[in-house]
Structures are given as C-alpha cells and as structure tokens.
C-alpha cells in the first residue's frame, strides 16, 4: 500500500502478544527517523506471510528480540 505524504509510520496497532521465534519468517526493526518518530518492529510470520507490528516496550517482545539476536550470533562465524 503506498503511503500518503502525511503518513510515514507503518504501524496502526501494535501487539503485546508473545511471538514464537520458530513461526517468524523475518523480523524488521525500523529505527525512528524524520518520517516516523518512533521505532517500529514488524514481524513477518511464516503463516500466510502475515505481517504484525510488535510493541517495542512489551516484555514479551523484548525477550523475542533477545532470542533472535542470540540465534543470529550463534549462526554468524
């Protein structure tokens, strides 16, 4: 969906629900910028490619980010 000039943030709602890292296809962290003054986290799920906005302040999401970064550091040489 193309964004209008005034709407640059992506997330309309944000989820506090825990996400199973195994169900994740991709996790995008979009830093705050001149276009959107807040960090946005978008999870792409393996199921039907659903994209879900996550709450960066949620404990469950912070734990998910830790788990994902741990997994990445294991994989990197």
């Amino acid at each position: 969906v193309p964004l209008s000039r005034t709407v640059r943030c992506t997330c309309i709602s944000i989820s506090n629900q825990p996400v199973n890292p195994r169900s994740l296809e991709k996790l995008e962290i979009i830093p705050a910028s001149q276009f959107c003054p807040r960090v946005e986290i978008i999870a792409t799920m393996k199921k039907k490619g659903e994209k879900r906005c996550l709450n960066p302040e949620s404990k469950a999401i912070k734990n998910l980010l830790k788990a994902v970064s741990k997994e990445r550091s294991k994989r990197s040489p």
């Epitope: 969906v1 992506t10 997330c11 309309i12 629900q17 659903e50 879900r52």
Partner: antibody
Framework: QVQLVESGGGVVQPGRSLRLSCAAS????????MHWVRQAPGKGLEWVAV????????SYADSVKGRFTISRDNSKNTLYLQMNSLRAEDTAVYYC?????????????????WGQGTTVTVSS | EIVLTQSPGTLSLSPGERATLSCRAS???????LAWYQQKPGQAPRLLIY???SRATGIPDRFSGSGSGTDFTLTISRLEPEDFAVYYC??????????FGPGTKVDIK
C-alpha cells in the same frame, strides 16, 4: 470484558457541531488503532476515519475531510470525533471500532471490536 | 479509488444450505487487505474474516473466505438460523482508506 461505548449523539441543526466520544475498557487501548464507521438509516456501512495507536496516523473519508477530526486520549482510554459543519447526509448511527492487534500498512487484521453505536440526526 | 461490488444483493436460502457470497473489486486488491463482516438488524457489525481467508477469533469453521486479485468469496457451508444477516466485504487501501461493499442480505427462503 472488552467493550466500546459511544456517546454524544443527538439531534443537531445543519451547519452546527457535535463531538462524539467512545470509552474503551477491557483491553490496552493505547496499543490499538481506532476507527469511526457510520451507517445511514436503511443503508450500508461507511468508513469515516482512522487514528493510529499513538495518534501519528490519521486518515479520513473524502465525504468528511476538512469537517471531521478524529483524536484520542490514551490516558482516558477515549476516542473522539469532532464533527463540524454538519449536513443532513451525516445523519447516521456512528460506531467506534477497534483495529485488530498488530495491524500495519502492510497487513490488515480487520475491525475486531465494535461499540453499539450512537445516533446523530442532522435536521432543521 | 477502488470500488467493491457485492453479489447477489439478496440471497434467499434455507437453513442447512450452502451460501456463496461474491465480492468484486474494480482493481486488484492484495488478499492481505480484504475482510468480511456480518451484521444483524439492530446490532453492530462483527468481524468474520481478515486477510481474505483467516477466520477471526471465535468464528465457527462453517465460515470460510477465499479469492485473490479482484474476486473474493465468502462461503457459509451449512446455514444455521443465526447466520441470516447482511454480509459486507471491506478493502483497505492507500492513505490508508477503508472501503465497504454495499452488502449482501442472506434471508430465509
């Protein structure tokens, strides 16, 4: 339980203003986008406006642009619709509705919770 | 602006029968952006389907959604007495803008 309760409807003359409120309870209001949707007597649903969870995203139907303003107060768990320059064609039941959990400009989870509506009648 | 057309306008069926409701868009719509709602007289709408085919929480599995591009379908496999209502499809587009179809009324034959 999860609930949305609209208030502020009534009979108003053309050209006048009215402010609708929607009180939310039973969920974390501050993480959900919110909508106003209306339904004229005997007609279908018409989307009016949306506001993102933090108020940064706002959008309006062409039919109300420049006349209606959507806003929210997350500290009061309340959504508002300020309606100015009202016309006879604005007569309808106005519903507030919650945007689904985690909706973004890339994936839409639908309006998953609705209030029972408040009636606005614009008549001289 | 994308326009949604629903057909038929009214569907007269008996309990136990299968209902097939159509929603056609004037331009291609991503299935990620299509939802279906049910509305009974004097009540608020209820979300049935999002993402064209995912059932909302608490929706019975007799309701299913399908389709892509410009043609989408809501199927009720076996009509129960409580399913007689008006059904709306809805599309989410740029800006963001949310558009409803005109509705299909499912009534008792």
């Amino acid at each position: 339980q999860v609930q949305l309760v609209e208030s502020g409807g009534g009979v108003v003359q053309p050209g006048r203003s009215l402010r609708l409120s929607c009180a939310a309870s039973g969920f974390t209001f501050s993480t959900h986008g919110m909508h106003w949707v209306r339904q004229a007597p005997g007609k279908g649903l018409e989307w009016v406006a949306v506001i993102g969870f933090g108020g940064l995203i706002k959008s309006y139907a062409d039919s109300v642009k420049g006349r209606f303003t959507i806003s929210r107060d997350n500290s009061k768990n309340t959504l508002y619709l300020q309606m100015n320059s009202l016309r006879a064609e604005d007569t309808a039941v106005y519903y507030c509705a919650r945007e689904g959990d985690g909706s973004s400009l890339y994936f839409y989870y639908g309006m998953d919770v609705w209030g029972q509506g408040t009636t606005v009648t614009v008549s001289s | 602006e994308i326009v949604l057309t629903q057909s038929p306008g009214t569907l007269s069926l008996s309990p136990g029968e299968r209902a097939t409701l159509s929603c056609r868009a004037s331009q291609s719509v991503s299935s990620s952006y299509l939802a279906w709602y049910q509305q009974k007289p004097g009540q608020a709408p209820r979300l049935l389907i999002y993402g064209a085919s995912s059932r909302a929480t608490g929706i019975p599995d007799r309701f299913s959604g399908s389709g892509s591009g410009t043609d989408f379908t809501l199927t009720i496999s076996r009509l129960e007495p409580e399913d007689f209502a008006v059904y709306y499809c809805q599309q989410y587009g740029s800006s963001p803008i949310f558009t409803f179809g005109p509705g299909t009324k499912v009534d008792i034959k």
